[in-house]
């Protein structure tokens, strides 16, 4: 083993290095000292380090480590953050277009149902957006509310437009009849299935991306333990105390230290791998009724079909509802 | 399979959109993201090595620092001596992860479970048991595009294509002007929505 080079007789070099870390402080001894108070850079002989310097080195080492960790994750973090934003915006655009398609369908095919239909369609797609973003809304409730709200308007405007004003206040009865008589056939059920499946998958996809960001942020801002700080100090800075300014840590030694410092973080690895593979599996399944774009952009057509179904059965329905809702009375201002 | 009568269009103008050779759909963007994410699959296990390679480490020098002294790069002491009489590395590892790391691991476990539950087997088609009422739902086969809805003879496919174009080529405005008679509705063989969302590379 080569003999250690003689320490800087005046600690001058160490001082100029340390000044860069802590300008203006007189913590560096003029000449090498025994360093019996040192706790990290334990000297084999005289040393150019003091206890205060050691503390500063520890702080710097931990800061360096945090910066290295942040630069390590920068590309990954950017990838997920940007994609999460892009997909969220894309999903919002899909919802907006789906709403516009549906409104256009009402406007062009059933003008007498607007503006009420616009209002219900607007509310429905508001809930769709809120659901995707994580709101605790039930998809079945949204779909039921859409058809419950639409049917009274369809009945009074399309099926029975000649109703006298006195008979117009039968919404309660018509809403009830909507489900009891299955006036839209199985279309509401079809829409529920398609919408709930596609939105669930979309929502979990966005949740997963946002959790990915949270994982990176968590490990990005980890505060390293004192023990780790000491190990890093010994690796990066203790050589300075002996005047060895240009010497670098051994590669194997660095790996051992890093594994020690990152033992906790590395435990994420197993779950991170599983996260990416599970996300891949989800993405591979996002098609047909598990693809919200496909489902929502086709909703206008399914709703159109459902109204046509009502119209096809209008004769039978009008008779049944006429009997069922004959006793509905007008609401009074009390 | 959505039937659309001719009188759907108040405005008979047909919107012509230039064919996009490599249209970027939402699903293609999702797959692209997954491919990029997969290149980071070993991110956490590779972190210690990554940080060593991005901090000053003796690569070409003959001598290196092992925490206590200057040693030859390939000697036994290069990795071992620096740890002696210092901190018990094994103990440091045994302490377990920080509470915040444990918390994030729990969240990952939870989302992984959700993702697995939600992941659908390939080739699954629209549930057939919805047809109990006997309305004409159109028999949706194993086509590339799911057919949606149902009655009638004029079939259009709803293609999955939210395209990321350089410009917003087409945007419906019922939203802002319910009374606008210049309203167009999807027609012909596909429904496309266009928007510029910028590229993520």
């Amino acid at each position: 083993q080569p003999p250690p080079p003689p320490p800087d007789a005046t600690c001058h070099q160490v001082r100029s290095f340390f000044q860069r870390l802590q300008p203006g402080l007189k913590w560096v001894p003029e000449t090498p000292v025994p360093g019996s108070d040192l706790q990290v850079c334990l000297p084999k002989g005289p040393t150019c380090c003091s206890r205060k310097m050691e503390e500063k080195y520890q702080l710097t080492a931990r800061l360096n480590m945090e910066q290295l960790l942040q630069s390590a994750s920068m590309e990954l973090k950017f990838l997920i953050i940007q994609n999460a934003a892009v997909f969220q915006e894309a999903f919002e655009i899909v919802v907006r277009h789906a709403k516009n398609y549906t409104n256009a369908m009402f406007k062009n095919n059933y003008p007498s149902l607007t503006p009420q239909a616009f209002e219900f369609v607007g509310e429905f797609f508001t809930d769709v957006s809120l659901y995707i973003l994580g709101s605790d809304i039930n998809v079945d409730d949204m779909v039921n509310e859409l058809f419950d709200s639409l049917f009274p308007v369809i009945y009074t405007q399309l099926m029975n437009p000649g109703l006298p004003d006195s008979a117009l206040d039968i919404n309660e009865c018509l809403r009830g009849a909507r489900r009891d008589l299955k006036v839209f056939g199985n279309f509401p059920k079809l829409i529920m299935t398609q919408v709930s499946k596609s939105l669930q998958v979309t929502r979990i996809f966005l949740q997963a991306l946002n959790l990915g960001i949270e994982v990176i942020n968590t490990t990005d801002h980890l505060k390293f333990s004192k023990d780790c700080g000491r190990m890093l100090t010994r690796m990066w800075y203790c050589s300075y105390c002996q005047g060895l300014m240009m010497v670098k840590p051994c590669g194997g030694y660095c790996n051992v230290v890093m594994q020690g410092c990152m033992a906790g973080v590395v435990e994420i690895d197993k779950y991170w791998r599983e996260y990416i593979l599970s996300l891949e599996e989800l993405v591979n399944g996002m098609y047909r009724i598990y693809d919200m774009e496909n489902v929502l952009l086709g909703l206008f057509s399914t709703i159109h079909d459902s109204i046509q179904y009502v119209q096809k059965n209008a004769g039978k329905l009008t008779t049944t509802i006429g009997k069922l809702c004959a006793h509905s009375q007008q609401r009074q201002y009390r | 399979s959505a039937y659309y009568p001719e009188d759907l269009f108040i405005d008979k103008k047909v919107l012509k959109v230039a064919h996009v050779e490599h249209e970027e759909t939402l699903s293609s963007r999702r797959r692209e993201l997954i491919q990029k994410l997969k290149s980071f699959i070993s991110f956490y296990s590779a972190l210690p090595g990554y940080i060593c390679s991005h901090s000053p480490v003796a690569e070409n020098d003959t001598l290196c620092w092992n925490g206590q002294e200057l040693v030859e790069r390939y000697s036994q002491k290069a990795a071992r001596n620096g740890m002696k009489n210092q901190f018990n590395l094994h103990e440091l590892k045994m302490k377990g992860p920080e509470p915040v790391v444990s918390q994030i691991i729990d969240k990952l476990k939870h989302i992984n479970q959700l993702l697995r539950t939600m992941s659908m087997p390939k080739g699954r088609v629209l549930d057939k048991n919805l047809d109990e009422e006997g309305f004409e739902s159109g028999d949706c086969g194993d086509d590339e595009d799911e057919c949606i809805g149902g009655s009638g003879d004029g079939m259009i496919k709803v293609k999955n294509q939210l395209r990321f174009l350089a410009e917003l080529a087409y945007d419906l405005d019922v939203d802002d002007a319910p009374g606008n008679s210049q309203q167009a509705t999807p027609k012909d063989n596909e429904i496309s929505t266009f928007h510029n969302l910028g590229n993520v590379h």
Partner: antibody, heavy 120, light 112 residues
């Protein structure tokens, strides 16, 4: 005609649970949600929760652990239950039908109210 | 939670007068979908509240046209063009833009 009729005890002890039944007529519980609101001199009107036509429920986060709303569609009845009532839960409790769109709606018809005093 | 503040607490009027009640919310009631979910109720003495106005300005079925609502964002007003005896009672504003729904403290409309 739309009506909501409430029934329940006026006096409740803290050890018991507070239960009120709302019986509706003129509409079906399979197509309308029913909300619960209370009114006290100290707190004014306070929204407690709702049961939707599907049977799904939403509660005020402050009271979620103590509240339960259930219903029987065939009997047109909605059941409100609050566990471990305290003195400051004394109030007039109202059920009301949801008008408008789900949680962005309003109460278009109200029950007559049930005055509840919690006292040991 | 969104705090709803009503002014005045008490409003003495003569029959036939115009009355105006103000309601202010601690945050905007304009929903991301463009709608504003602000409603007005009237509670007559010893009775349950009744819905008067929903979504800022829509009169509920059977409500006389002397009642009108207006406002936007965080400031709203209920106006009664000519007060009648049956209009006396406590008026409440309420919002359903944000969960939980919240109510104002009430404004008592009474005879001078």
């Amino acid at each position: 005609q739309v009506q909501l009729k409430q029934s329940g005890p006026g006096l409740v002890q803290p050890s018991q649970s507070l239960s009120i039944t709302c019986t509706v007529s003129g509409f079906s519980l399979t197509s309308y949600g029913v909300h619960w609101v209370r009114q006290s001199p100290g707190k004014g009107l306070e929204w407690l929760g709702v049961i939707w036509s599907s049977g799904n429920t939403d509660y005020n986060a402050v009271l979620i652990s103590r509240l339960s709303i259930k219903k029987d569609d065939s009997k047109s009845q909605v059941f409100f239950k609050m566990n471990s009532p305290q003195v400051d839960d004394s109030a007039i409790y109202y059920c009301g039908r949801n008008g408008g769109w789900l949680l962005r709606g309003f109460m278009d018809f109200w029950g007559q109210g049930t005055s509840v005093t919690v006292s040991s | 939670d969104v705090v709803m503040t009503q002014t005045p607490l008490s409003l003495p009027v003569s029959l036939g007068d115009q009355a105006s009640i103000s309601c202010r919310s601690s945050q905007s009631l304009l929903h991301s979908n463009g709608n504003t979910y602000l409603h007005w109720y009237l509670q007559r003495s010893g009775q349950s509240p009744n819905l008067l106005i929903y979504k800022v300005s829509n009169r509920f079925s059977g409500v006389p046209d002397r009642f009108s609502g207006g406002g936007s964002g965080t400031d709203f007003t209920l106006k009664i063009s000519r007060v009648e005896a049956e209009d006396l009672g406590i008026y409440f504003c309420s919002q359903s833009t944000h969960v939980p729904w919240t109510f104002g403290g009430g404004t008592k409309l009474e005879i001078k």
